[in-house]
Each structure stands twice: as C-alpha cells, then as structure tokens.
C-alpha cells in the first residue's frame, strides 16, 4: 500500500567493514525522500538520515553501541513535497532490512603489515591493529580489542627468489618465523575469524618485502 506517488525501498543491503556500517537501498528517488529507522530486537526505533534523497545511510554510530546485538532497519518513503503524507493504512510506506549482527557479519578489512624485523634467522612480522569506531570508556577500540582471540591472522611468506610459499598463524598481531640467513622474503597477511560461518576471511594485505623501508635488520 502507499500513496500513488511514492514507491517502497527495495534491495535493502548492509555494507559493513570493520564495523563501519552503511545501509544501502534502491531505487534512486524520483519525487520522494527517505528516512531510516534502526532498532535492536528488543529496543525502540531511532530515526536517522531524515528526509534524504540519498540511497544510503551511515548507521555506524548506532551499531557500535553494542556490536553483539542484532539490528533491524527500515526505510520509509515519503512524497518529496509532502513528508506528512501517509499510505492508505495511515502509515508511511516502508520496507524492512535483513537482520544484521555486526560482530558476526561485519567484513574484515584488508589488513596491513605494520613492520618486520629480522634478527639473525628470525623475523618478527607485526600486523597493524586497526582502529575501529567501536568505543569503550571514550576511546576507540582496535580490531583486536573487539574480537580478542576470535580473530587470527594467517601469514604467507616466501623467498623473493622462489615461488614456494610457507604459512604461519597467530592469535595475536605478531608472527615470529624462521628464515634462511642472507635471503630476502616477502610477506602477506589475511585476517580470519574461525568461528564464523560467513564473512570469515579478509582479502590479503598488500605484499611487503624485505629490502624495503618497512623492515629492519639486525645481526
């Protein structure tokens, strides 16, 4: 139902990486505007992105309040010149989003190798602990702060002179690996949340190689 000159939003989709979370939908508005509401399963609806002509709404500020909650959003459609207008049932036209649980579903962003340091035949590779928009006690938490031991990293490494790769895992942000002295190595890391069933793995980090400025060598 609804007024003759508005159409309901459709294809409501959550786009979320490292908890930065945006709701997207269609269609591009013609003579209509949208307002978004979000709530937890047991909570009250909160309105966001009032009377917008955009087809996306940043809901990060709401979902970071409790990333383990399950959220539902809905998008209301209003005639552009008459936002008080309602549908035939006395309510504005709206469409519900799929449910979204940030902790279980946010995509893992591409990790970054922060540094690597060689000491003899050992190399310590450190993964940057990316800051999220999740807050606790007025400070922003890192990805590791949020996920704890649920988050692991897989390291791929190989000699610059060969194609054969090796791998190692860590549930911290550091790897300590054995290397052959006098050889240069390249590194790439991937974030994984083993307990998940969807959005389990990140894309690989950019490759970093020894002999470039991120590294440090000590005898």
């Amino acid at each position: 139902s609804g007024t003759t000159n508005t159409v309901a939003a459709y294809n409501l989709t959550w786009k979320s990486t490292n908890f930065k979370t945006i709701l997207e939908w269609e269609p591009k508005p013609v003579n209509q505007v949208y307002t978004v509401q979000i709530s937890t399963k047991s909570g009250d609806w909160k309105s966001k992105c009032f009377y917008t002509t955009d087809t996306e709404c940043d809901l990060t500020d709401e979902i970071v309040k409790d990333v383990k909650q399950t959220y539902l959003a809905r998008v209301f459609s209003y005639p552009a010149g008459n936002v008080e207008s309602t549908g035939s049932a006395g309510e504005p036209l709206y469409e519900n989003s799929p449910e979204f649980t940030p902790y279980l579903e946010t995509n893992l962003g591409q990790p970054t190798i922060q540094s690597f340091e060689q000491v003899g035949t050992k190399v310590n590779v450190t993964v940057e602990d990316e800051r999220t928009l999740v807050r606790r006690n007025n400070t922003f938490l890192s990805l590791r702060d949020v996920f704890g031991k649920d988050l692991i990293y897989t390291l791929y490494y190989w000699k610059s002179s060969s194609s054969g790769k090796k791998t190692a895992k860590t549930n911290t942000n550091e790897f300590l690996i054995d290397v052959d002295k006098g050889e240069n190595y390249c590194f790439s890391v991937q974030a994984v949340i083993p307990s998940r069933t969807v959005n389990r793995k990140s894309t690989d980090s950019p490759v970093e190689c020894m002999g470039q400025e991120k590294g440090e060598f000590r005898e």
Partner: antibody, heavy 117, light 107 residues
Framework: EVQLVESGGGLVQPGGSLRLSCAAS????????MHWVRQAPGKGLEWVGW????????IYDPKFQDRFTISADTSKNTAYLQMNSLRAEDTAVYYC??????????WGQGTLVTVSS | DIQMTQSPSSLSASVGDRVTITCKGQ??????LSWYQQKPGKAPKLLIY???SLADGVPSRFSGSGSGTDFTLTISSLQPEDFATYYC?????????FGQGTKVEIK
C-alpha cells in the same frame, strides 16, 4: 549439510598422472581453507598441502611441491589435487578436509590411489 | 619443520580405564594443536582444537591439555567405541605435521 566427496582415485602406473577432485556441498569453499591429507596403507596421516580457494594461495609440504598441484574452482565448489610423476610410495588413501583456520572440521571419505605396474 | 613425537605408539586398555596420549613438538606451538580420532576405513574425526577446546558433539570424557611444546589427550573413562587410532596435528606453521598415531586396543 556439509559434505566433501573425493573422486578420481584408481590404479596408475609409475610415472603416470592423476587428478583427484573434492566436491563440496553445504558451504562455499572460498570461505575456508581446503587441505589434502594422505594415508599410506597401514600408516599414519601425512599432510600434503592447502589452498585458499578465494585467492588461489597454495602451501605444500616441500616434499610434494614439485610433483603435486592443488587448485580450486569456486564456481564448481570443488578443490583438486593434480599428481604427476607418481611413484609406488604415493599409494595411499587421499582425503580432502575443510579448515576453519582453527581446526579441520570436515573430511571426505577418501579416495584410494594405487601406483603399480 | 616441526616434528611431532606422539607416544605411546600403541596401548592396551580396558573399558573404564583412564587413557593418556602425549604429543611433543620440537618448538612452541602456541596452542595450534588439534587431536583426531580415526577408525579403520574411516576419515579422521576432530576431537580437540586449540589444544584444550572440545569439538562440538564430542563426549566430555575426552579432554586436551598442555601448551608450548607438550600436549596431552586424556580419555577419562574408556568406552567400547573409543578403540581407535588417535593423531595430534600441529597447524601453526607449514608444513603441518601429524604425530605418528597412537592405536588404542582392547586389553
């Protein structure tokens, strides 16, 4: 229901080649790591290698690096093990397994490869 | 490569016995160790992961302990269906390596 089904095993002459398949159902292989593990008759388990089907990264036990190749086709939800220059000592049951990164939670039933003249 | 030394290679025990199998790594594994049970003609089955965590559906008589280089699988009260071969696996760095296996037989 998660299932892994290996196929492609059989009798092959020394020096020959064989391609094993591991067809997955109930999940997308691109979301996991996929491994090949083998077991010679009456012997223990031996890790062959893994693939991340999403990006094609492969890791092998160095002893298999030159003769074996692991690949995956995400559109078919299938992982493969290409084995070349086969030897009598490659005779084994070959298993594929799904890896969550924390553990190998599902295994196929295995396919027997016999290398003999 | 990290060699995994599993012991004993076999043992005989009776129903109700407490059974302990150990696995020793050459280097620190940081809990990247899991235990598997295999019955003749069957694929291995996950029992324990992260050295101490019980896999879904596995009876609580199975437990894992240890850290660093030394790990243990314990069956607190052996049941008839537990007669099988048990393997540890380190998967913290490649090449991943299994222990040689421990065959648990009926006394």
């Amino acid at each position: 229901e998660v299932q892994l089904v290996e196929s492609g095993g059989g009798l092959v002459q020394p020096g020959g080649s064989l391609r094993l398949s591991c067809a997955a159902s109930g999940f997308n292989i691109k979301d996991y790591y996929m491994h090949w593990v083998r077991q010679a008759p009456g012997k223990g388990l031996e890790w062959v290698g893994w693939i991340d089907p999403e990006n094609g990264n492969t890791i092998y036990d160095p002893k298999f690096q030159d003769r074996f190749t692991i690949s995956a086709d995400t559109s078919k939800n299938t992982a493969y093990l290409q084995m070349n220059s086969l030897r009598a000592e490659d005779t084994a049951v070959y298993y594929c397994a799904r890896d969550t990164a924390a553990y190998f939670d599902y295994w196929g039933q295995g396919t027997l490869v016999t290398v003999s003249s | 490569d990290i060699q995994m030394t599993q012991s004993p290679s076999s043992l005989s025990a009776s129903v109700g016995d407490r059974v302990t199998i150990t696995c020793k790594g050459q280097r620190v594994l940081n809990s990247w160790l899991s235990w598997y049970q295999q019955k003749p003609g069957k694929a291995p089955k996950l029992l324990i992961y992260y050295a101490t965590s019980l896999a879904d559906g596995v009876p609580s008589r199975f437990s894992g302990s240890g850290s660093g280089t030394d790990f243990t699988l314990t069956i607190s009260s052996l049941q008839p269906e537990d007669f099988a071969t048990y393997y540890c696996l380190q998967h913290g760095e490649s090449p991943f390596t299994f222990g040689q296996g421990t065959k648990v037989e009926i006394k």
